[in-house]
């Protein structure tokens, strides 16, 4: 029997510390907010070219309009991030051509193709939820007991709104049992 | 060749208004990815950043600092202009102009000025 | 009390290897905002010394490293030399801070 540490929830993807989850349903952009804080997370804030690199890719393999955390709703033209810091100089390279433009009072953010965009916060959109990986120290005893005998994650997107979350984040920690032959 | 200048009165009294210049070469600010920044030291002391601009004209201040700051770019000069209202002598301190490329990392810095605070 | 925390002084001999750590927190390196590094001789200006994490500008010794994990950092020096004293300053941003920001800064003294 081997155990395992798994720093992320199921469905949640590992990546430089943090894990992250990528929507299967759509909301709006304030809803998606409320998404990512039910389950103890927060909608994306890129902090780095190589975050940046790993969300876009993620983003246009699967061709989704995703939400980020990132708006200029309270002060036009002065984008910032959900965690109440910038838009840094930086990351203004990330904007697609033309972009942002503000067509029409764009002022929330997307990933969209190979870059961002502004769109309609009340549109409904795929969303990234991030959060910091869990610990995988034995010492501060977070290994759970084993997990109900269900071989794999349910299947992507059979919970309908925030269920998929949820029903991701019941398991943070499984022990994975080998039977090696 | 990057180059980086300051320019500015080396006393001020209490109560004034510090006005300092950067003049630089080699870039320019109207290029996207580029930014200017203020950062100073005072004597046998660290480092503080204290304003940034960039090309799109976007401003950056230090919280602690906010309400005595103003920066400003002339982009046909080459010059970054950089106000400190309410001068104090805690305010003493070799003030640096550096560029700031891609990646945040202030890569190119001026000699630097010092600025001496005191009636 | 600086964010980004430094001993305030190392020291080596010539030919040693020195490391100097900087330690921030989940508002600044934590949060996976890079780190660079500068070395200020006496009298001079700062001078970019390592940038994002790991790298070096064009000129800079490959005896100069830095590394990068979790909430803190470090610059590495191998065989040291005399000119190599100076003041070490590593440098985030900080999300909470809405800035950016240095670290105390480490005087590296090279001994004998």
């Known amino acids: 029997t081997e155990r395992l540490c798994h720093p992320c929830p199921w469905e949640w993807t590992f990546f430089q510390g943090n894990c992250y989850f990528m929507s299967n349903s759509q909301r709006n952009w304030h809803d998606s907010i409320t998404a990512c804080k039910e389950v103890g997370a927060q909608l994306v804030v890129i902090k780095s070219a190589e975050e940046q690199n790993f969300l876009q890719l993620q983003s246009s393999r699967s061709n989704r309009f995703t939400w980020m955390g990132l708006s200029d709703l309270n002060q036009e033209g002065t984008w910032q991030w959900v965690d109440g810091s910038p838009l840094l100089p930086s990351f203004k390279q990330y904007w697609n051509r033309g972009e942002p433009n503000n067509v029409g009072e764009e002022d929330c953010a997307e990933f969209s193709g190979n870059g961002w965009n502004d769109d309609k916060c009340n549109l409904a959109k795929f969303w990234i939820c991030k959060k910091s990986a869990a610990s995988c120290s034995r010492d501060e005893e977070q290994f759970l007991s084993p997990a109900p005998a269900t071989p794999n994650p349910p299947p992507a997107g059979s919970g309908g709104g925030l269920n998929d979350i949820f029903e991701a984040q019941k398991i943070e920690w499984h022990e994975h049992h080998h039977h090696h032959h | 060749q990057v180059t980086l200048r300051e320019s500015g009165p080396a006393l001020v009294k209490p109560t004034q208004t510090l006005t300092l210049t950067c003049t630089f070469s080699?870039?320019?600010?109207?290029?996207?990815?580029?930014?200017v920044s203020w950062i100073r030291q005072p004597p046998g002391k660290a480092l503080e950043w204290l304003a940034l601009i960039d090309w799109d004209d976007d401003k950056y201040y230090s919280t602690s600092l906010k309400t005595r700051l103003t920066i400003s770019k002339d982009t046909s000069k080459n010059q970054v202009v950089l106000t400190m209202t309410n001068m104090d002598p805690v305010d003493t301190a070799t003030y640096y102009c550096?560029?700031?490329?891609?990646?945040?990392?202030?890569?190119?810095w001026g000699q630097g000025t010092m600025v001496t605070v005191s009636s | 009390q600086s964010v980004l925390t430094q001993p305030p002084s190392v020291s080596g001999a010539p030919g040693q290897r020195v490391t100097i750590s900087c330690t921030g927190s989940?508002?600044?390196?934590?949060?996976?905002?890079?780190v660079h590094w500068y070395q200020q001789l006496p009298g001079t200006a700062p001078k970019l010394l390592i940038y994002?994490?790991?790298n070096r500008p064009s000129g800079v010794p490959d005896r100069f490293s830095g590394s990068k994990s979790g909430t803190s950092a470090s610059l590495a020096i191998t065989g040291l030399q005399a000119e190599d004293e100076a003041d070490y300053y590593c440098?985030?941003?900080?999300?909470?801070?809405?800035?950016?920001?240095f670290g105390g800064g480490t005087k590296l003294t090279v001994l004998g």
């Open positions: 080699g870039f320019s600010l109207s290029t996207s990815g580029m930014s």
């Open positions: 994002v994490n790991s």
């Open positions: 550096a560029r700031m490329a891609l990646r945040h990392a202030f890569d190119a």
């Open positions: 989940s508002s600044n390196i934590g949060a996976g905002y890079d």
């Open positions: 440098q985030s941003y900080d999300s909470s801070l809405s800035g950016w920001v």
